[in-house]
């Protein structure tokens, strides 16, 4: 960075609030889509180019002028695996976090024309190509349809779909948000013969109802009703089916074969939590009890003689936790070998660290192929010779990410493929492999500017730089940018990591106001090596505020001892640890302990509120955006994973003594800004409404802002700008800044 150590002598502009809100300085991505083991698609100036990975040469796959006469704004595209057709998505209408409806048309790349017959209906909820060829499965009005050819009529697979009641091939609200992180509940077999799907029944699930005010001209607000199981309420039920798409006919109804949950699940409420095809005729299903410390994997084979699916009890694999819950958020997915007779899976080892274990389908026990006081983040690819994974092993930094490969014939032969490529600039990698893992794109997202490179798996040599953000680098040379410090403190003989966004020309002999940016939910991580341009960048650069984050007990990727510390006790240690972190930061000598603030969104809003309501005396003020205020208000799947059930026999006492409302009196000692969107389908406005009521009831003066018709993201352009401007004013006022 050019300039000088002396802030007064540095005439460069700072990174302003407007820079953040208007996205003045844009990080360039390099988003590719692999279409084979050696080719990928990349969108450039709205042309779709096809690149050869080995040589880097490209040709135009589809010109931007192709759809000039289309008459619709194309939101997204998807090319069939055989490269013959392109699915065009338009009329996109967002629903929840992942779900949306849209219209679709199919363009024949050979005939260079749109297919006009037997079109997919408007308001389709999900569409997906088969993994090979060009079959299509889609969901419309909660029912599943299959197209064998894009120009042929659809075959209807299900007939039971009913809005808000029966969902075939798509998730209901809670499965979308908390289980599959997707709207889709359809899974093609590898060659597209079978289509597996889940059916969710929300008949008995209570509805959350909230007003949607819409346009000013709407005299009576609309009421939105969503089946949403809160903690302890009636949950959706699930069934699982497989249909053979080769047997579909217009004149007879499709026969879907049900695969029932294991007996150990059927004894009570349970979830379907993972579906993975092992081979063309073998599928693995993972089921999870409502009390999420016990899961079962079933491995089911197709019996051609009966047309049924058999799941042998001898092939069941049980995964359980005695200290908390199974998985980070749910049981991890298996990665099967080519023959389908064995698989690799991330599970907790004896020491409570998540590592890769090798399973044979007919054996109960598995063999760990990685070990150490670090964690495997994800399995990224599996070939006949190697398994590729991302971990945070390197230099013992939980907030780093690197790509490794392990030799399957000798587990001692492990190579870090990314660690030494650019160690100063790049410490946080993700990866995208080609279809058979012959090539991979490394995406480095920090601590330096993002860097995208292409590599060959044959010799792990770098082939070329795809994007280095050099243009942005040049622009930022003229800006007084903050620096980022990543370090740890030791509490009770345990390392706890924090990050600080430090103002330009940071001088440790000076005193700075500090804002603690908190999330602190189970398995969260806020201290990492990622480069970001965000609100904190502005606060540090322009307002000279230190923005710190701390990963205390409950945080992830450092072993279950830390993560499971808050099991059945949300609102305790993770809250206390944020307060303790602020105390530790105060002792570092460069923090003005009269000007410490805290802010957070969602779970972070809950922790912020609990911290401010603790009466610690550490914090002057804080902002809670869309906070949870009482765990009985939040959804069953997330809440019960950590808290169990709100019943006297289980954990009702702690549900009741972990509310924000019970701390209302202590808010007299702090300045509090409470913000919520009125159309938040996730953390309901109810949660802030109850905080507000409790504060009013005890005579606390506080500030509040609602965002009409905004959901949990408060992400519309105007609302996003308004909320950050409003929060900036609040923080500046709190810190007595001009």
């Amino acid at each position: 960075n050019k300039g000088t150590d002396d802030a007064t002598a540095d005439s460069r502009k700072t990174y302003t609030l407007t820079d953040y809100l208007k996205n003045t300085y844009r990080l360039k991505l390099y988003s590719l889509r692999w279409i084979s083991d050696h080719e990928y698609l990349y969108k450039q100036e709205n042309n779709i180019l096809v690149f050869n990975a080995e040589y880097g040469n490209s040709s135009v796959f589809l010109e931007n002028s192709t759809f000039d006469e289309f008459g619709h704004s194309i939101n997204d595209y998807s090319i069939s695996p055989d490269g013959q057709f392109i699915l065009l998505e338009y009329n996109y209408v967002k629903q929840w976090r992942h779900s949306y409806t849209a219209s679709y048309d199919i363009y024949d790349l050979n005939k260079r024309q749109l297919i006009t017959e037997e079109r997919i209906p408007n308001n389709t909820q999900w569409v997906t190509w088969s993994p090979v060829g060009h079959k299509l499965a889609y969901v419309w009005n909660n029912d599943i349809y299959v197209k064998i050819e894009p120009n042929l009529p659809s075959y209807r697979i299900t007939w039971t779909g009913k809005e808000d009641i029966i969902y075939n091939g798509i998730t209901d609200w809670v499965y979308e948000e908390e289980v599959f992180s997707a709207y889709s509940a359809l899974w093609w077999s590898p060659n597209g013969t079978f289509l597996a799907y889940a059916q969710f029944n929300d008949t008995e699930v209570p509805l959350i109802e909230y007003s949607f005010y819409s346009d000013e001209s709407l005299q009576y607000p609309k009421t939105v009703r969503v089946p949403y199981p809160k903690a302890g309420a009636v949950n959706p039920t699930v069934k699982f089916f497989v249909v053979n798409t080769d047997s579909l006919s217009s004149v007879t109804n499709a026969t879907s074969i049900q695969i029932t949950a294991p007996a150990s699940m059927l004894i009570g409420d349970h979830y379907l939590c993972d579906v993975t095809w092992a081979t063309q005729e073998r599928i693995s299903l993972q089921w999870l009890r409502r009390i999420q410390n016990y899961s079962v994997m079933d491995i089911c084979d197709y019996d051609e003689s009966s047309g049924r699916w058999n799941c042998l009890v001898a092939r069941q694999h049980i995964e359980m936790s005695t200290t908390g819950w199974v998985g980070r958020f749910r049981p991890s997915e298996p990665h099967f070998t080519l023959d389908g007779n064995s698989f690799y899976k991330i599970i907790s080892n004896e020491e409570g660290y998540r590592h890769i274990c090798y399973f044979q389908i007919d054996k109960k026990d598995c063999t760990f192929i990685t070990k150490g006081t670090w964690e495997v983040i994800g399995i990224e690819a599996l070939t006949s010779d190697y398994l590729y994974y991302i971990s945070n092993e390197y230099k013992g930094m939980p907030g780093g990410r690197n790509l490794y490969k392990i030799q399957l014939s000798d587990y001692t032969k492990v190579t870090c493929l990314s660690c030494e490529l650019n160690p100063e600039r790049c410490q946080y990698y993700s990866v995208s492999f080609s279809k058979e893992a012959k090539y991979y794109q490394l995406r480095c997202s920090g601590p330096g500017l993002p860097l995208y490179t292409l590599h060959s798996s044959v010799n792990d040599k770098g082939l070329r730089v795809l994007e280095d953000n050099s243009a942005l680098d040049k622009m930022l040379q003229n800006v007084q940018m903050p620096s980022k410090k990543l370090d740890f403190i030791i509490l009770n003989e345990t390392k706890f990591w924090y990050q600080m966004i430090l103002p330009p020309h940071f001088d440790k002999s000076k005193k700075y106001p500090l804002l603690l940016d908190v999330y602190a939910g189970p398995c969260s991580q806020k201290a990492d090596t990622v480069f970001r341009l965000n609100w904190a960048t502005y606060l540090a650069s322009t307002e000279n505020i230190i923005v710190a984050s701390f990963d205390g007990r409950g945080s992830g990727y450092q072993g279950d001892k830390i993560m499971h510390a808050i099991n059945r006790r949300l609102g305790t240690f993770e809250v206390e640890d944020q307060i303790e972190a602020a105390r530790q930061f105060s002792k570092m000598g460069f923090v003005d302990n009269k000007r410490i603030a805290i802010w957070g969104w969602s779970y972070g809003g809950y922790v912020t509120s609990m911290v401010l309501g603790s009466g610690s005396g550490v914090f002057k003020c804080g902002i809670a955006v869309a906070p949870v205020s009482r765990w009985e208000y939040y959804d069953s799947v997330y809440t019960e994973r950590y808290m169990g059930l709100p019943t006297p026999e289980d954990n009702l006492d702690h549900y009741r003594n972990s509310t924000v409302m019970s701390r209302a009196e202590n808010f007299k000692q702090v300045e509090y800004l409470l913000i919520h969107g009125t159309a938040d389908d996730n953390v309901h406005f109810q949660q802030s409404a109850q905080i507000s009521k409790a504060l009013v009831d005890v005579g606390v003066d506080f500030q509040a802002m609602w965002y009409t018709d905004e959901d949990h993201g408060i992400a519309s352009s105007t609302a996003h700008q308004h909320i950050y401007t409003h929060m900036s004013h609040f923080i500046k006022q709190c810190f007595s800044l001009p």
Partner: antibody
Framework: EVQLVESGAGVKQPGGTLRLTCTAS????????VHWVRQAPGKGLEWVGV???????DYDAAFMSRVTISKDTSKSTVYLQMNSLRAEDTAVYYC??????????WGQGTTVTVSS | DIQMTQSPSSLSASLGDRVTITCSAS??????LNWYQQKPDGAVKLLIY???NLHSGVPSRFSGSGSGTDFSLTISNLEPEDIATYYC?????????FGSGTKLEIK
């Protein structure tokens, strides 16, 4: 390779019973339906009925009362039984595989003559 | 039942000719129409499914078109091996029904 082979040809007595066998190979009878069609001498093709992959059956109304289609998946065979035979049942009988909404593979046909 | 009417019942054409056979349905069947070829030895093969889709392995000189009630099969360049009887068949509704056939001969 997909193949269908009909057998059971011969001369049948009027009023008697016909039982034809279709032996399938190269595909599963639990996945694909198998149809029967017949062709009287010098005439066109006439659909008789189908047995679907899941074992359900459908028949032309003209044959409903005297035709039964069944299968033995372990032997990969489909059967056509026709009772109360009459002279007009004399025909070449074909079995064929159902692929979605068309017949993609046909047997070579088997000739049945109904005569006293 | 849906009646299928085929015409002509027979036709004679020269090698290399373009030949068209038509088929009409007694009610609308959208595009649910298939064409089959029956050789003189009785062997039957699928040519076209769903009105216009060529079955794998069928020469590209065969093409199909039409929707609703009127359909046609065209052979663009007649070859000696095309001597056969051609049948249309509707697949929209049970019972499936066939046209009466068109016998194609070489002049």
């Amino acid at each position: 390779e997909v193949q269908l082979v009909e057998s059971g040809a011969g001369v049948k007595q009027p009023g008697g019973t016909l039982r034809l066998t279709c032996t399938a190979s190269g595909f599963s009878l639990t996945t694909y339906g198998v149809h029967w069609v017949r062709q009287a001498p010098g005439k066109g093709l006439e659909w008789v009925g189908v047995i679907w992959g899941d074992g359900r059956t459908d028949y032309d109304a003209a044959f409903m009362s005297r035709v039964t289609i069944s299968k033995d998946t372990s032997k990969s065979t489909v059967y056509l039984q026709m009772n109360s035979l009459r002279a007009e049942d004399t025909a070449v009988y074909y079995c064929m595989r159902n692929r979605h909404d068309w017949f993609d593979y046909w047997g070579q046909g088997t000739t049945v003559t109904v005569s006293s | 039942d849906i009646q299928m009417t085929q015409s002509p019942s027979s036709l004679s054409a020269s090698l290399g000719d373009r030949v068209t056979i038509t088929c009409s349905a007694s009610q609308g069947i959208r595009n649910s129409l298939n064409w089959y070829q029956q050789k003189p030895d009785g062997a039957v093969k699928l040519l076209i499914y769903y009105s216009s889709n060529l079955h794998s392995g069928v020469p590209s000189r065969f093409s199909g078109s039409g929707s609703g009630t009127d359909f046609s099969l065209t052979i663009s360049n007649l070859e000696p091996e095309d001597i056969a009887t051609y049948y249309c068949q509707q697949s929209i509704k049970l019972p499936f029904t066939f046209g009466s056939g068109t016998k194609l001969e070489i002049k």
